[in-house]
């Protein structure tokens, strides 16, 4: 009887099924959808999380899946193909053989095509800009306090190395968090900025992926920081390839 059997859970991913019957009596926590045994000491990849989300019973989903024509607030919900390591495959296709290329955070970066569409490589998203608007407060937050609190959040909650939080900007009521991580900078074991941004996005929406933890309670010097709007912009190492028709629409 081991400690693993006493506490066989996945703190970093509640969309798992855990059992204490792994090798040597260790706990194994398998992601819903893919069935992969995930590392519960760090964040699960966004691809496996999306796959788990799409495998959940429809009535358990709290959000409505937006129309493919939606331009804002599109959750980007689809059942992705993940590679052997649980990352997004460069090419994604739906049930009707419509295909498109995605970046490393699973966001479409080309026009949609058919099965002949080629996506030669998975293009890395190396810069993520998280744009937040907070609810009105008595006064503006102190910029350096806000900066420190958000850096602490990404370091402690999402286990993202501090060097990848490039900047925190603040002009009341807008907060911008810049995450940067080039391919050459990311070492084995480093949390991916795309995964950290996805966990943060779900936290902000009140849909925490962490097991058994309360929701995100962001405070700056004791003052609650309540977000009323979030926009996330993704910049890829290679610019996306959309037709002019889409750009002028």
């Amino acid at each position: 009887h081991t400690a693993a059997q006493d506490n066989c859970t996945c703190p970093t991913n509640k969309m798992t099924v855990c059992s204490p019957d792994g090798p040597g009596g260790r706990c194994q926590c398998r992601a819903l959808g893919s069935g992969m045994a995930v590392d519960c000491s760090t964040l699960t990849s966004k691809c496996l999380l999306l796959k788990a989300r799409m495998s959940a019973p429809k009535n358990a989903r709290t959000l409505v899946r937006p129309s493919e024509h939606a331009l804002v607030d599109n959750d980007g919900l689809y059942d992705p193909d993940c590679d052997p390591e649980g990352r997004f495959k460069a090419r994604q296709c739906n049930q009707t053989s419509v295909c498109w290329c995605v970046n490393s955070v699973g966001v479409r970066r080309t026009d949609k095509g058919d099965l002949s569409l080629r996506c030669d490589e998975l293009v890395r998203t190396h810069h993520i800009l998280i744009d937040l608007r907070h609810r009105p407060t008595a006064g503006a937050f102190n910029h350096s306090d806000l900066d420190a609190e958000l850096r602490r959040l990404f370091r402690e909650r999402y286990r993202l190395h501090p060097k990848f939080v490039a900047a925190v900007h603040y002009e009341q009521p807008t907060i911008q968090i810049e995450l940067r991580q080039n391919t050459s900078q990311k070492a084995a074991g480093d949390v991916d900025i795309g995964d950290a941004a996805y966990y943060f996005e779900r936290d902000i929406k009140g849909e925490s992926l962490f097991q058994g933890r309360g929701g995100l309670d962001l405070r700056v010097r004791g003052e609650p920081l309540q977000v009323e709007r979030t926009l996330i912009y993704y910049l890829d190492e290679i610019p996306p390839k959309f037709s002019m028709k889409r750009l002028t629409a």
Partner: nanobody, 120 residues
Framework: QVQLQESGGGLVQPGGSLRLSCAAS????????MSWVRQAPGKGPEWVSY???????YYPDTVKGRFTISRDNAKNTLYLQMNSLKPDDTALYRC??????????????WGQGTQVTVSS
């Protein structure tokens, strides 16, 4: 990029034997723990054997004494010898790059799999 390619599956009668192989590339095979994971129709995945980089092996009770995991580091290949096969062993068998933490069993990557069907 990690690549794992299984082979050796097929149709076999109850009591028969099969040997599965997994060709690995894209990582240091000799320094990695590996496992075989199977998924029967309508069921979740389950590990059926585990081997550390040093050669220590683990098996669940369901296959102990019937399955043997081994590795050839010179060939970057993992093997699973399956004897005394039963209809319950019918499943898709995948090899996985795995590891053990203090408390958890983790699969970092896995292959597409090879189908094993045990039927008379």
């Amino acid at each position: 990029q990690v690549q794992l390619q299984e082979s050796g599956g097929g149709l076999v009668q109850p009591g028969g034997s099969l040997r599965l192989s997994c060709a690995a590339s894209g990582f240091t095979f000799s320094g990695s723990d590996m496992s075989w994971v199977r998924q029967a129709p309508g069921k979740g995945p389950e590990w059926v054997s585990y081997i550390t980089s040093g050669g220590t092996t683990y098996y669940p009770d369901t296959v102990k004494g019937r399955f043997t995991i081994s590795r050839d580091n010179a060939k970057n290949t993992l093997y699973l010898q399956m004897n005394s096969l039963k209809p319950d062993d019918t499943a898709l068998y995948r090899c996985a790059k795995s590891r053990l933490t203090d408390s958890h069993y983790v699969e970092d990557a896995w292959g597409q799999g090879t189908q094993v069907t045990v039927s008379s």
